[in-house]
């Protein structure tokens, strides 16, 4: 069959058609329609709407729409004995105890059901003892503290300011500094933009307002009780003792006003420099403990969570492709929310109802896309990624067999400034001709296109005229597809203005105050930001699931590979004794990327000359593009990093969010000065180079022509 | 091949002075703390100071036994880091050691005595 | 200052048997702990870093356990070049303390 066949409008008009069909006012609707009450995972709303949507895909036209249920994990707090902390004095009384729960939002005042802020997965345990300010509780605040300031961690309770790095990094790095309890809380330096009101009457955080969110180091592990396969009725279980990723202290966020009884009274050694000082009045002192006056009182923790099996529910839907139906393209975000999701996830989730809507639309037409399109509402994201994760457990034989690509849809909005995408280097082109052809919404860019305002809002750092794409690095479900299995992925969300925001992520993110209203008033009252990340993700699955030849262009992960090559290297060479010392030599890698660079520039050429009407010599080219990626994994993993299997990408060990490059030899290289044993570690950085530079020849190997 | 070579010691008066050297090579100096230890048979192993790289602000820390009366100092461009020892006492004697960070990596060792 | 003690001060041994040297340290040093080995006229040499972890080149018959406050550094066959002295140190704060050493010597 030529693609044509499969459907009743010319090529030309299909992608038109498309996006034509995609109105910001329907996904508006959708948008106040999930968020009306909180959808906690695990709980019966949630539930209620995974069948909601199941039900509404069905009546937009896709072929089948299933639930897919695991059994996971999932923490929350003690509806009797709530979470929360205390200042004592020395005879053991509370004098101060931190608030038991946000003030609900105007209109929101009799929900039931609004989880208080909590940790989740935090142990039980009440640990009292001093305090010590950490900042961030980045890997370099505490070696600032042990390693300069000489301050020992050791039995104390340390308090740290959200942003800049995953939550869990921040714990895992407390705990391995002895810490015996975290508090987080949101520092208004990070989540309190300067000339703009708190919620409700602007988008700032609150006083009483908490980020809530998991603390786990998964690592990529999913359900923390079955690693590495699905959590299933006849699952075996781990206990809870050998569990992946959870964290051995106690942990319990708070707010700014909480904060400020806490930090007021902080002793000990003044902040090393201006980088450890938020926006409160307060001295920002390290401690330990308070101070003169103060000294006998003492901080306790209060947390009574508790960690339950759970059923958790996948929605999956199905638009079968008309010519290649066993190659699968995959647009999926999840479901649930910590409290209303007013922009994670629901912003992301009426996007994607829109997006399904769209394509119903046209198949009720007679249209069917060339390769089957997968739709997936994704649940317990917020308690480690494990929907997704379990799913593509369950799964992955198919997948790895026959998945094209992963879109990721989580929150659409995170600001209305320009957007922002982080995607695999074989997208970096699709999404270049994609933006390209659609309108841009900003102001003061009318009548140009999306390419256009975003270039000029967020250019590359290393190519003039283009704009910047990220790497993809972890905490949203793209995970499992990404760096696990080795499917080509990417994500598009409009982002607010880095140079002059910069605080973390977006005041409100995963409280109580993210509601249908923060969205509707403030940030996107017109809906035109989400109907645009709406054409890019649902333009980027139209692409993918449609062109004759897969959108993939390989000679753009052989310049990304270079350039990785050149940083790596030029890293190491920090240590050019070392390298001559212990014969460290980084030629094999830079022949293995030259040898990329060459077989891609000639697979590129072959690509443009094939006859695309033979269907076999058609398929065997697009399986080269497909299989790409999938070269890119180890089947070993990386080190003490199992989930983690793509060599030239990975979550970084010092923060989930961000992407690094050839983590393998990143990781092995990381502060080796400190190592012990350097004859050991230089021998760990000959054998990462080793392995990605195998890596690298053996995937350039498979664009080589076949025969 | 790791080295650590310690020169400057030998016999100086009570309220003397003297400055040991410590030259290394087989790695990149500049990257790695310092320290000295010391070594008589009554107290056996007795660290004196350290030195931090220059991404640690060059910073020390010194014994209380010594605090001062010595300076630890460096030169990266060298490879070079130096004890100036100052108003010298017989609990002074010892050998003193040049040693890479964690002491994974020691000097032969030069030897100090303080006797009239 | 963390006080770090070691016990015996000496022990005797014949080749070939297995021999346990201990270090007790004053109050909680985690894994901080090294063993060093010091051959007459010479300097130390690591054995041990991170109280169990064998220092690049050191044979597997030395290994070490613990953490803490007590610690072990095992000679599962003494070899007569073995019959030296032994240290053991902490790295966890300042200032850094060894102990006072055990002496193996020929029964």
């Known amino acids: 069959k030529s693609s044509n066949e499969a459907t009743n409008i010319t090529p030309k008009h299909n992608m038109k058609a498309f996006l034509d069909e995609l109105k910001a006012e329907n996904i508006k609707k959708f948008l106040y329609n999930f968020t009306q009450i909180p959808h906690l995972a695990g709980t019966e709303q949630n539930f209620q709407l995974a069948k909601q949507i199941q039900s509404q895909w069905k009546e937009f036209g896709l072929d089948s729409v299933e639930l897919a249920h695991y059994d996971v994990l999932l923490s929350y707090p003690n509806k009797t004995h709530p979470n929360y902390i205390s200042i004592i004095n020395e005879d053991g009384n509370e004098i101060f105890n931190t608030s038991l729960f946000e003030p609900p939002p105007p209109g929101y005042e009799n929900v039931s059901d609004i989880v208080p802020p909590f940790s989740a997965f935090s142990p039980q345990g009440m640990p009292e003892g001093d305090l010590v300010y950490v900042n961030y509780a980045r890997t370099e605040d505490f070696f600032k503290l042990e390693r300069d300031m000489k301050i020992n961690c050791s039995g104390k309770i340390v308090i740290a300011r959200y942003g800049k790095v995953f939550r869990g990094n921040k714990v895992k790095n407390a705990q391995l500094a002895g810490a015996k309890g975290v508090i987080l809380y949101s520092d208004p330096a990070d989540y309190f933009a300067p000339g703009v009101k708190s919620y409700p009457d602007g988008w700032n955080l609150p006083g009483g307002g908490v980020q809530r969110g998991n603390i786990l180091n998964l690592n990529g592990a999913g359900d923390p009780l079955t690693p590495g396969y699905p959590a299933n009725e006849y699952a075996y279980r781990r206990g809870i003792a050998e569990a992946v990723g959870l964290p051995s202290i106690p942990v319990h966020p708070i707010g700014y006003y909480d904060a400020q009884k806490l930090l007021e009274k902080m002793g000990g050694s003044a902040p090393p420099d201006s980088s450890w000082r938020g926006s409160l009045k307060v001295p920002y002192n390290v401690g330990p403990g308070f101070t003169g006056n103060f000294s006998t009182q003492k901080v306790k923790m209060h947390i009574h969570s508790t960690n339950e099996v759970t059923r958790i529910y996948n929605v999956i839907g199905t638009l079968r492709g008309a010519v290649e139906p066993d190659r699968y393209v995959i647009l999926g975000g999840h479901r649930d929310s910590w409290v209303f999701g007013g922009i994670d996830p629901q912003s992301g989730a009426a996007v994607v109802h829109e997006i399904v809507r769209s394509f119903g639309t046209l198949k009720k037409e007679g249209w069917r896309p060339r390769r089957t399109i997968l739709f997936a509402s994704w649940d317990a994201e917020e308690f480690g990624l494990l929907g997704s994760t379990e799913w593509a457990e369950e799964n992955s034989r198919l997948l790895q067999e026959r998945g094209v690509a992963y879109i990721n849809a989580d929150s659409s909005i995170e600001g209305n400034y320009t957007l922002r995408v982080d995607c695999t280097p074989l997208m970096y082109s699709l999404v270049h001709n994609l933006t390209k052809e659609l309108k841009s919404p900003d102001e003061g860019f009318e009548g140009k296109s999306l390419y256009e305002s975003w270039t000029k809002k967020s250019p590359s750092p290393e190519f003039s005229g283009m704009p910047r794409i990220s790497k993809l690095g972890s905490g949203n479900d793209f995970e499992v597809f990404f760096q696990r299995l080795g499917i080509a992925s990417g994500r598009a969300r409009y982002t607010k203005n880095w140079e002059t925001n910069k605080f973390s992520g977006y005041p409100l993110y995963h409280s109580v105050y993210e509601t249908y209203e923060l969205v509707e008033k403030f940030y996107d009252p017109m809906f035109k930001y989400h109907l645009t990340v709406a054409q890019v993700r649902g333009g980027m699955v139209f692409e993918l699931a449609n062109s004759i030849v897969l959108p993939f262009d390989c000679r753009d992960y052989a310049v990304v590979l270079r350039k990785y090559a050149d940083k790596i290297y030029s890293i190491s060479m920090k240590h050019p004794q070392e390298m001559k010392t212990y014969s460290v030599s980084f030629d094999s890698l830079f022949s293995a990327v030259k040898n990329f660079t060459e077989i891609a520039s000639k697979f590129s050429e072959r690509l443009q000359d094939f006859d695309k009407s033979n269907p076999i010599v058609l398929r065997m080219m697009n399986d080269q593009l497909m299989f790409l990626e999938r070269a890119f994994i180890d089947p070993l993993g990386l080190p003490d990093r199992p989930f983690y299997r793509h060599v030239i990408y990975a979550p970084s060990s010092h923060n989930k969010y961000a992407g690094e490059s050839f983590p393998g030899i990143y990781d092995a290289l990381f502060d080796i000065e400190s190592k012990v044993d350097p004859s050991k570690a230089w021998g760990e950085v000959k054998r990462q180079i080793y392995v990605a530079a195998f890596t690298v020849q053996a995937a350039a190997e498979t664009l080589s022509e076949v025969a | 091949e790791v080295k650590l070579e310690e020169s400057g010691g030998g016999l100086v008066q009570p309220g003397g002075s003297m400055k040991i050297s410590c030259v290394a090579s087989?790695?990149?100096?500049?990257?790695?703390?310092m320290n000295w230890v010391r070594q008589t048979p009554e107290k056996g192993l007795e660290w004196v100071a350290e030195?931090?790289?220059?991404?640690?602000?060059?910073?020390?820390h010194y014994a209380e036994s010594v605090k001062g009366r010595v300076i630890i100092s460096r030169d990266d461009s060298k490879s070079s880091v130096y004890l100036q020892m100052n108003s010298l006492r017989a609990e002074d004697t010892a050998v003193y050691y040049c040693?890479?960070?964690?002491?994974?990596?020691w000097g032969q060792g030069t030897t100090v005595t303080v006797s009239s | 200052n963390i006080v770090m003690t070691q016990f015996p001060k000496s022990m005797s041994a014949s080749a070939g048997e297995r021999m346990t040297l201990t270090c007790k340290a004053s109050?909680?040093?985690?894994?901080?702990v090294s063993w060093y080995q010091q051959k007459p006229t010479q300097s130390p040499k690591m054995l041990i870093y991170?109280?169990?972890n064998r220092f690049t080149g050191v044979p597997d018959r030395f290994s070490g356990s613990g953490s803490g406050t007590d610690f072990i550094l095992t000679i599962s066959s003494v070899q007569a070049e073995d019959l030296v002295d032994y240290y053991c140190?902490?790295?966890?704060?300042?200032?850094?303390?060894f102990g006072g050493g055990t002496k193996l010597e020929m029964k």
């Open positions: 087989g790695f990149t100096f500049s990257n790695y703390w």
């Open positions: 140190g902490q790295s966890y704060t300042f200032p850094y303390t």
């Open positions: 030195i931090r790289s220059q991404s640690n602000n060059f910073a020390t």
């Open positions: 109050e909680n040093v985690g894994t901080y």
């Open positions: 991170g109280a169990s």
């Open positions: 040693t890479r960070r964690w002491n994974n990596f």
